[in-house]
């Protein structure tokens, strides 16, 4: 065992000497993001008051490719690195194409309504005119290529020239543009050659070793890993944690069970209740609020202002009143939690499928005339899964390596 | 050429209700928020209070209690009325055309002179 | 009701580059974008900037805006006769829900 373990410790750290660098580098897992929207079926009359019908489309699936550039390694036991993303549609994983057409709310209005729900009313009637002028809706009927990637829109320019610097956006606005193309930030992490008890684990992310989005120094601590690889030699005692960039936030997984992938042993980890509960059910993450009902996490210090919510899908372990507040969503624990199946020896991922919802808060606003009547709600406009598993060459290496080998020398 | 004139009386005994009308030509009064503007002779420039086409009315509230401000569409008009006034509202009031960029048209100006 | 602070005049000979501050606080100039008015002698004020640094077609190249934090300013540079006026700048206030003037400076080019 003393020599698996060293087998182990001098394979996983991050070093350019080490089996698993290659794979850290360029992770061989394909990775693949499945998108499901919530087509809204009635919006002129959630615009007269009533409760929004929604029917969830997908899933458009694209592949995700991953490298790592400017890895650079410092002199206190960790590396600086880029990790670039790029997505590729696949037609024949998914059910339909990028030219579907969904009816979303129009978060750019929307959003802008409830951020002026506090401006003077002049402020808001202008407002109303600068959108009637452009010709902007609550509510608008683009393609799925167009809300993933963006699309052209003059209210953009409009943000951006009375509201400077509020907005992330240049000419195009769509919920997954900032993803493609670019990097997620720069993560610095431990590579475990001096001490590999902190192997993996963020020492600074874009510079920071805490953010200041939130509330509370516990809510704006950066946590865990990148949220890829994690220390070896867990235990059912462990918990898996990450920074995530997207969430702007650190979240930590709980041990479920231990199962079988492809022959190797793994420990499956998944969301607690408490994630996304708000501070009232789970003190700790009162830094996270003002919150509104518990199992949904308002995310707009991070996201230009807007009030978007991050959640599990169908408001899965959320108060049911979300879900009920809107027609067409059905929770399920199988179809819409998220799971981690992490080899407890190595630390290395398995098989995972990461699975959460965006949604928009909207309401009617006085003095926002494109508001109407719309009462207040939490409307799911996506959800998406990221999964991957190990397979062919990676996978026949990893147990050849880690769980045949291990075999044959114990006896 | 979108042009603003204000009309009403020039003098006005304390106490009493100031009324002015602007009139809007070479544009539609639906299309923009319209306001009044005053500026005591050599001093500043004091923000009164907008008014949109469909009634909606917004006021700086040190002028609230005392100032209605109303619209008339079929006329392309709107109108102020500044009640119980002192000789401290003496001054020349504007009315502007009001959008996203500011106050982007003004009309020249009317004194209204507070005096018994 | 608060108004945002202006120097009361400013000076420059012809040619030369005058600077005109506009103070603050983070309920007006802190949240919102500035304009600046230019005023004539015995004439309405007109818009000359727009959302912190835009100028409306019309108004030269010379006249500049820029919003720092809470504070903001206009510059004239290449000063002109012409540019004698009372210049005020104005913001939108979230605490007295409204429009806010700045108290005016007067140029006068000497």
């Known amino acids: 065992p003393s020599l698996i373990k060293q087998q182990v410790l001098k394979n996983v750290r991050i070093d350019p000497s080490s089996l698993s660098f290659n794979m850290w580098k360029e992770i061989p897992i394909p990775f693949y993001l499945s998108v499901y929207f919530f087509d809204v079926m009635n919006p002129s009359e959630i615009l007269k008051g009533e409760k929004p019908q929604v029917r969830e489309r997908g899933p458009y699936v694209y592949r995700e490719f991953r490298h790592k550039s400017n890895i650079t390694f410092n002199n206190n036991d960790t590396v600086s690195f880029l990790e670039y993303r790029t997505f590729q549609f696949q037609p024949s994983k998914s059910h339909g194409s990028e030219s579907d057409y969904i009816v979303m709310p129009n978060i750019l209005v929307l959003g802008a309504a409830v951020m002026m729900e506090n401006k003077p009313m002049t402020l808001k009637l202008i407002m109303t005119l600068a959108f009637t002028t452009l010709g902007e809706r609550a509510f608008m009927n683009r393609t799925v290529g167009e809300i993933m990637w963006g699309y052209k829109d003059p209210l953009v320019n409009l943000i951006n020239k009375y509201f400077p610097g509020m907005f992330p956006f240049k000419d195009k606005f769509g919920l997954f543009a900032e993803l493609n193309n670019s990097d997620s930030g720069l993560f610095t992490v431990f590579t475990g050659v001096q001490n590999i008890s902190r192997i993996h684990l963020v020492d600074k992310w874009n510079g920071l070793s805490k953010v200041d989005f939130w509330h509370s120094d516990q809510c704006n601590m950066i946590n865990g890993t990148s949220g890829q690889m994690w220390p070896p030699f867990m235990t059912p005692e462990s918990s898996l944690e990450f920074y995530s960039p997207e969430a702007c936030r650190s979240m930590k997984l709980m041990y479920k069970e231990s199962g079988v992938f492809e022959g190797i042993p793994t420990y499956r980890f998944v969301a607690p209740k408490t994630l996304f509960a708000n501070g009232s059910i789970y003190p700790p993450n009162e830094g996270f609020c003002p919150c509104l009902e518990s199992g949904i996490q308002n995310v707009s210090t991070c996201r230009f202002s807007a009030p978007l919510f991050l959640s599990h899908p169908h408001f899965l372990n959320a108060d049911p009143v979300l879900a009920e507040a809107v027609t067409g969503l059905h929770p399920n624990q199988e179809a819409h939690s998220l799971f981690l199946d992490i080899h407890p020896v190595t630390g290395i991922p398995m098989n995972c499928s990461v699975k959460l919802q965006l949604s928009l808060y909207m309401k009617s606003v006085a003095g926002i005339g494109q508001t109407g009547k719309i009462e207040p709600v939490v409307l799911p406009l996506l959800w998406f899964a990221e999964s991957g598993a190990m397979e062919g060459e990676t996978l026949h290496t990893f147990y050849t390596q880690l769980v045949l080998m291990p075999k044959v020398m114990h006896y | 050429q979108l042009q603003l004139q204000e009309s009403g009386p020039g003098l006005v005994k304390p106490s009493e209700t100031l009324s002015l009308t602007c009139t809007v030509s070479?544009?539609?009064?639906?299309?923009?928020?319209w306001s009044w503007i005053r500026q005591p002779p050599g001093k500043g420039l004091e923000w009164i209070g907008n008014i949109y086409y469909s009634g909606i009315t917004d006021y700086s509230p040190s002028l609230k209690s005392r100032v209605t401000i109303s619209v008339d569409t079929s006329k392309n008009q709107f109108s102020l009325k500044l009640s119980s006034v002192t000789a401290a509202d003496t001054a020349v009031y504007y009315c502007a055309r009001l959008t996203l960029r500011g106050f982007q048209n003004w009309g020249q100006g009317t004194l209204v002179t507070v005096s018994s | 009701q608060s108004v945002l602070t202006q120097p009361p005049s400013a000076s420059g000979t012809p040619g030369q580059r005058v600077t005109i501050s506009c103070s603050g606080s983070?309920?007006?100039?802190?949240?919102?974008?500035v304009n600046w008015y230019q005023q004539l002698p015995g004439t309405a004020p007109k818009l000359l900037i727009y959302?912190?640094?835009q100028r409306p077609s019309g108004v030269p190249d010379r006249f500049s805006g820029s919003k720092s934090g809470t504070s903001a300013s206009l510059a004239i540079s290449g000063l002109q006769s012409e540019d004698e006026a009372d210049y005020y700048c104005?913001?939108?206030?979230?605490?007295?829900?409204?429009?806010?003037f700045g108290t005016g400076t007067k140029v006068t080019v000497l």
């Open positions: 104005a913001a939108w206030d979230d605490s007295p829900n409204g429009v806010i």
């Open positions: 070479g544009g539609s009064i639906s299309d923009d928020l």
């Open positions: 959302s912190n640094n």
């Open positions: 983070s309920s007006n100039i802190g949240s919102s974008t």
